[in-house]
Structure formats: structure tokens, C-alpha cells
């Protein structure tokens, strides 16, 4: 697995460098976890031919991916730091089922999985320190996620590699639609 | 090897719309953002505005009560509208794909001069 | 909008000299600049990204450093083929914006 944000060899060398600010930190470790899926995918699109797939549409409908709209206040018109802080949080939370559907779709990068599981929550902790309305963000029921859980992992084989190329793709696009805006704040 | 190519009308009469269009060959169209540039003669560059696959845009506000950025998935196409052009807007007009951070690749540019 | 300023605006160099080109952003855009260098007729070329990343295939002469709103590009060993306007571009907000360039030139 990769080496955690703030732990690479580059700032070991550059002990004068200043620290992270908040924003960087959070930069930095949506990075990483970029990079995790990266690598999953690469394993995902050499197992498979999911990646080039024309099918894909018809498996997407069926999936309840999160995804950035013009009223969740993230994109420059109408953008809305408090607004779309709740979506990114909200969103990332909603992905963690999806997550853990994917710890046992990896066999040689079983490891990195994880890292992107465990990195998402760190990453959810420092956004929650970010948000100043904390009420506003609603989490997953638990039971749902349960029996979404066991759906996934009941569908045949092509839709569950299909479901695996599907959530890292809309993961990495949600991602980078957050950092994005993450920036602005 | 990613290339970006792009085509549109060079010459144009002032209130005319300028159209310009690339095309990304030998790379996935839908993980990055494409966004338009231009740079008026012996000026600096200046950003217009950007898509995603999705359709969302953004826009430099100073162009965009004329500037429309549409895409088009299905030909990995993504084009440029101006509308009501004046001489100012004369200048190379260059299409470039963003990721997370720097504007990594270009289009060969466009020179678009505008003259009555 | 963020004002990117570049200085000087030009400079003449020789080969082999180093060469130092500052940015100086309006309000502070953490480390999120890029620098860009481009020959005449052609389309700009990203050097550098995260304001010290040096982007794939760039060589090592070239380096960037600061955070905040003092940026500099620094070439450490001139050589022929550098001579060129640079530029700098924050991407922290919207609208992207980018320094007015500096033009390197032969001394």
C-alpha cells in the first residue's frame, strides 16, 4: 500500500518546509486516495474489459452512485462553501458502502483497497472539522447499506465487475469534483 | 499518446459568433476537465471557461454573457461559443485538458482574427 | 478575480546563467500554481504544478518554490533552447488566472 499522506520521502527531506495548512492537508490526502484508485482500477481494467465496455449505462441507472449537481452549491455558479461542504461530506459518507463492497473484488491489490477505505474515513474526519453545521449532513441508515451490501454481492459475475469499475470511476470523479471546490474555501 | 485537435472559422465580421471545436485522441475524455484559452497578439493567456463530460461548466464571468461550452461524449469532442464578437477578441484560441492541477496538455491553437 | 503579477517582465541572460522569475498572487492560493514556458507560434508547456512539482519529461534545471502569494521559477543553468516567455497560473480559484508573462531573452 501506498505510504499515508504526510509520510512520503519528500518530507523527510524538506524538514524546512512550512507545515500543511487545513486545506492542504485535506488536498493531500484526497490525492492519495486518488492514486489508491488509480491502482485499483489498473488492476480492474487489465482483469477485465469492463473499462471499454458499452454496457456500462444500462449497470450505472442501477447503482445509486453519489454525484455533484449544480444545486449542491460546488461548482463557480452558486457556489456555496457551507452547502457544498455538507454534499462532500454527505457524499463521501454514501460512498463508504461502496467501499467496503469492494474489500474482497482485489487480489493483488487487496491491500490498497483498504488504504482507499481507511484514507476516505480520515478524510470524512478532517472535513468534519471544516463544517460548522454538522447537523445538516445525513448519514447512511445503516440497515439500508446492509441489504445494498448483500444485493451487490449476490449479482453475477460481469455485474460485479461492472458494479467495481463503476464505483471507482464515479468515486474518482466525485473526488476530483471535491477538490475542486475544496480549494475555494 | 493524448493529442488534442482542434478546428473553427479563422476569419469573422464583428457580431459574427465564433465556433471552435477539439477533439481528444488516444485518452479517456471523461476524467478531466477541458477547458478553452485564448491570447490576444503579443498579450498574455487568459482562461475562458471549462466542461466536464458531465456538462457542468465553469466560466471566466468576464466572457460569460457570450460563452457557451458544450461537449459532445460520444465523438470525445468538446467546442467553444462566442457570440457577438468584436475586434478585441482577435487572438490564437488553444483548448487544453486540466486534471487536479496544471493545464498538461494543449491544442495546437487557432488563430481567430476578427475584422469588419 | 486573483491577480497573478509577474517580475521583471524581461530579462536578458547568457547560457549557464541562473535565472530567477517571481510570481506574486493577490490573495494567498496555498501551493496551487503552475508555471508554464512557451516559444513563439506555439502553444504554452506545463513545467510545473503544486508550485514545486516538476511536471514529467521537464528537466531538472528547472524549480519552483513558495506558498501563500511569493512564488519564484528558478532555472538554475540557462540554456539555449529555455529562452522563452514563462508564465504563472493559479488554480485555487475561479476564473483560473495567469501572471503577464516574462520573456527570457538572449543577452
Known amino acids: 500500500a501506498p505510504v499515508p499522506p504526510g509520510e512520503d520521502s519528500k518530507d523527510v527531506a524538506a524538514p524546512h518546509r512550512q507545515p500543511l495548512t487545513s486545506s492542504e492537508r485535506i488536498d493531500k490526502q484526497i490525492r492519495y486516495i486518488l492514486d489508491g484508485i488509480s491502482a485499483l482500477r489498473k488492476e480492474t481494467c487489465n482483469k477485465s474489459n469492463m473499462c471499454e465496455s458499452s454496457k456500462e449505462a444500462l449497470a450505472e441507472n442501477n447503482l445509486n452512485l453519489p454525484k455533484m449537481a449544480e444545486k449542491d452549491g460546488c461548482f463557480q455558479s452558486g457556489f456555496n462553501e457551507e452547502t457544498c461542504l455538507v454534499k462532500i461530506i454527505t457524499g463521501l459518507l454514501e460512498f463508504e458502502v461502496y467501499l467496503e463492497y469492494l474489500q474482497n473484488r482485489f487480489e493483488s491489490s487487496e491491500e490498497q483497497a483498504r488504504a482507499v477505505q481507511m484514507s476516505t474515513k480520515v478524510l470524512i474526519q478532517f472535513l468534519q472539522k471544516k463544517a460548522k453545521n454538522l447537523d445538516a449532513i445525513t448519514t447512511p441508515d445503516p440497515t439500508t447499506n446492509a441489504s445494498l451490501l448483500t444485493k451487490l454481492q449476490a449479482q453475477n459475475q460481469w455485474l460485479q465487475d461492472m458494479t467495481t469499475h463503476l464505483i471507482l470511476r464515479s468515486f474518482k470523479e466525485f473526488l476530483q469534483s471535491s477538490l475542486r471546490a475544496l480549494r475555494q474555501m | 499518446q493524448v493529442q488534442l485537435q482542434q478546428w473553427g472559422a479563422g476569419l469573422l465580421k464583428p457580431s459574427e459568433t465564433l465556433s471552435l471545436t477539439c477533439a481528444i485522441y488516444?485518452?479517456?475524455?471523461?476524467?478531466?476537465?477541458w477547458s478553452w484559452i485564448r491570447q490576444p497578439p503579443g498579450k498574455g493567456l487568459e482562461w475562458i471557461g471549462e466542461?466536464?463530460?458531465?456538462?457542468?461548466?465553469n466560466y471566466n464571468p468576464s466572457l460569460k454573457s457570450r460563452v457557451t461550452i458544450s461537449v459532445d461524449t460520444s465523438k470525445n469532442q468538446f467546442s467553444l461559443k462566442l457570440s457577438s464578437v468584436t475586434a478585441a477578441d482577435t487572438a490564437v484560441y488553444y483548448c487544453?485538458?486540466?486534471?487536479?492541477?496544471?493545464?498538461?496538455?494543449w491544442g495546437q491553437g487557432t488563430m481567430v482574427t476578427v475584422s469588419s | 478575480d486573483i491577480q497573478m503579477t509577474q517580475s521583471p517582465s524581461s530579462l536578458s541572460a547568457s547560457v549557464g546563467d541562473r535565472v530567477t522569475i517571481t510570481c506574486r498572487a493577490s490573495?494567498?492560493?496555498?501551493?496551487?500554481l503552475a508555471w508554464y514556458q512557451q516559444k513563439p507560434e506555439k502553444a504554452p508547456k506545463s513545467l510545473i504544478y503544486?508550485?514545486?512539482s516538476l511536471q514529467s519529461g521537464v528537466p531538472s534545471r528547472f524549480s519552483g518554490s513558495g506558498s501563500g502569494t511569493d512564488f519564484t521559477l528558478t532555472i538554475s543553468s540557462l540554456q539555449p533552447e529555455d529562452f522563452a516567455t514563462y508564465y504563472c497560473?493559479?488554480?485555487?480559484?475561479?476564473?483560473?488566472?495567469f501572471g503577464q508573462g516574462t520573456k527570457v531573452e538572449i543577452k
Open positions: 487544453a485538458r486540466e486534471e487536479l492541477d496544471d493545464f498538461d496538455i
Open positions: 488516444g485518452g479517456s475524455f471523461r476524467e478531466y476537465y
Open positions: 503544486a508550485a514545486s
Open positions: 466542461i466536464f463530460h458531465s456538462g457542468s461548466t
Open positions: 497560473q493559479q488554480y485555487k480559484s475561479y476564473p483560473r488566472t
Open positions: 490573495q494567498g492560493i496555498s501551493s496551487w
